[in-house]
Interface confidence: low
């Protein structure tokens, strides 16, 4: 069963998902989609990474953490009730049926106090830079094709109710993760 995360209307929602690259800079493709994880890929893709970078993303959906180190947690900016539902984080490990799939349930609650209107085109109002707290990973990346054997040492997800990426990073850095497998 999926883990549940909560946020209020107008806030940024945080959906954690992590993996540890087998070697620094050797990234594994990841997709985020709206809806439970299907057999393959992600449905209704909102963001996708490849072996090097984020190669597809849509407005309001961000990887605020250090995805070059495997923090592929999704931030959804300025959520509305329509953002409620199941989200799929799929870590696309090479090989047949090797993917790790995480279904995360996002529950959006009405705001306790009506938030001030967000200036949608003003980045700092909608999604402050202050949320970033971690450095980026290695400068050089290699394609997975050069790696005959991918060993992901850790694929983990935070089970805490976390809305703020700074808090998420602080907790993760202090070991507040759940090991999968």
């Amino acid at each position: 069963s999926e883990v549940e995360y909560r946020a209020e209307v107008g806030q940024n929602a945080y959906l954690p998902c992590f993996y540890t690259p087998a070697a620094p800079g050797n990234l594994v493709p990841v997709c985020w989609g709206k809806g439970a994880c299907p057999v393959f890929e992600c449905g209704n893709v909102v963001l996708r990474t490849d072996e090097r970078d984020v190669n597809y993303w849509t407005s309001r959906y961000w990887l605020n953490g250090d995805f070059r180190k495997g923090d592929v947690s999704l931030t959804i900016e300025n959520v509305t009730l329509a953002d409620s539902g199941i989200y799929c984080c799929r870590i696309q490990i090479p090989g047949i049926m090797n993917d790790e799939k995480f279904n995360l349930k996002l529950v959006i609650k009405p705001a306790k106090v009506t938030p001030a209107p967000t200036r949608q085109r003003d980045f700092t109002a909608a999604f402050p830079r202050m949320l970033t707290t971690r450095g980026h990973g290695p400068a050089e990346t290699q394609t997975l094709g050069s790696l005959p054997d991918i060993n992901l040492t850790q694929i983990s997800t935070l089970a805490n109710e976390l809305r703020d990426s700074r808090l998420a990073n602080d907790l993760r850095d202090s070991g507040a993760t759940i090991r999968i497998g």
């Epitope: 970078d53 984020v54 190669n55 993303w57 849509t58 407005s59 309001r60 961000w62 990887l63 605020n64 995805f67 070059r68 085109r121 003003d122 980045f123 700092t124 909608a126 999604f127 402050p128 830079r129 202050m130 970033t132 707290t133 971690r134 450095g135 980026h136």
Partner: antibody, heavy 121, light 107 residues
Framework: EVQLVESGGGLVQPGGSLRLSCAAS????????IHWVRQAPGKGLEWVAD????????DYADSVKDRFTISADTSKNTAYLQMNSLRAEDTAVYYC??????????????WGQGTLVTVSS | DIQMTQSPSSLSASVGDRVTITCRAS??????VAWYQQKPGKAPKLLIY???FLYSGVPSRFSGSRSGTDFTLTISSLQPEDFATYYC?????????FGQGTKVEIK
């Protein structure tokens, strides 16, 4: 090969306008933020504005807010800086630079050669 | 705004010298600090990102470190092509801010 090429600089009178262009090649600007950084003659570097084209997000230094507008045309893989109500203190070499990854906040891994803007009567 | 106080503003050194440039942030910026090298008439070049990561293609004689809000760029053995101006930059919060620069000159 990643390349950024600025154009549009020149001499303009105080109160005038200029539009700078930053043509990118070797990468898709949708996947990166584009920043404008300026350097007055003999001075240090000053961040001016940036944009994340995919989300349309923009941010400005207080010194240029309400006078400068940053934009991007992803079909042309080009970013722009529209500069209005120019002042003498805007005189500088203007560089466009690419954010190392797609997020707004980042170090700048590629820079253009710069274009000189001179505001003088 | 976060101030990045860079020191020294200039220094004279010889080829082979170990050179250290420091930058102090006026408040916490975590590891969100980059270092750039700029030569006259040229655009800056990224040397170090995230306080201590060496950017691709940059010689290993360059290194960066962090201690709280103090950041250091070290050139272990100065080479002739290293004579330039160096800038630190924080990108932790908006607006991103640069240090005033350190000019490394030949002694």
């Amino acid at each position: 090969e990643v390349q950024l090429v600025e154009s549009g600089g020149g001499l303009v009178q105080p109160g005038g306008s200029l539009r700078l262009s930053c043509a990118a090649s070797g990468f898709n600007i949708r996947n990166h933020a584009i920043h404008w950084v300026r350097q007055a003659p003999g001075k240090g570097l000053e961040w001016v504005a940036d944009i994340a084209p995919a989300g349309g997000y923009t941010d400005y230094a207080d010194s240029v807010k309400d006078r400068f507008t940053i934009s991007a045309d992803t079909s042309k893989n080009t970013a722009y800086l529209q500069m209005n109500s120019l002042r003498a203190e805007d005189t500088a070499v203007y560089y466009c630079a690419r954010g190392y990854v797609y997020r707004m906040w980042d170090s700048y891994d590629y820079w253009g050669q710069g274009t000189l803007v001179t505001v003088s009567s | 705004d976060i101030q990045m106080t860079q020191s020294p503003s200039s220094l004279s050194a010889s080829v082979g010298d170990r050179v250290t440039i420091t930058c102090r942030a006026s408040q916490d910026v975590n590891t969100a600090v980059a270092w750039y090298q700029q030569k006259p008439g040229k655009a800056p070049k990224l040397l170090i990102y995230s306080a201590s990561f060496l950017y691709s293609g940059v010689p290993s004689r360059f290194s960066g470190s962090r201690s709280g809000t103090d950041f250091t760029l070290t050139i272990s053995s100065l080479q002739p092509e290293d004579f330039a101006t160096y800038y630190c930059q924080q990108h932790y919060t908006t607006p991103p801010t640069f240090g005033q620069g350190t000019k490394v000159e030949i002694k």
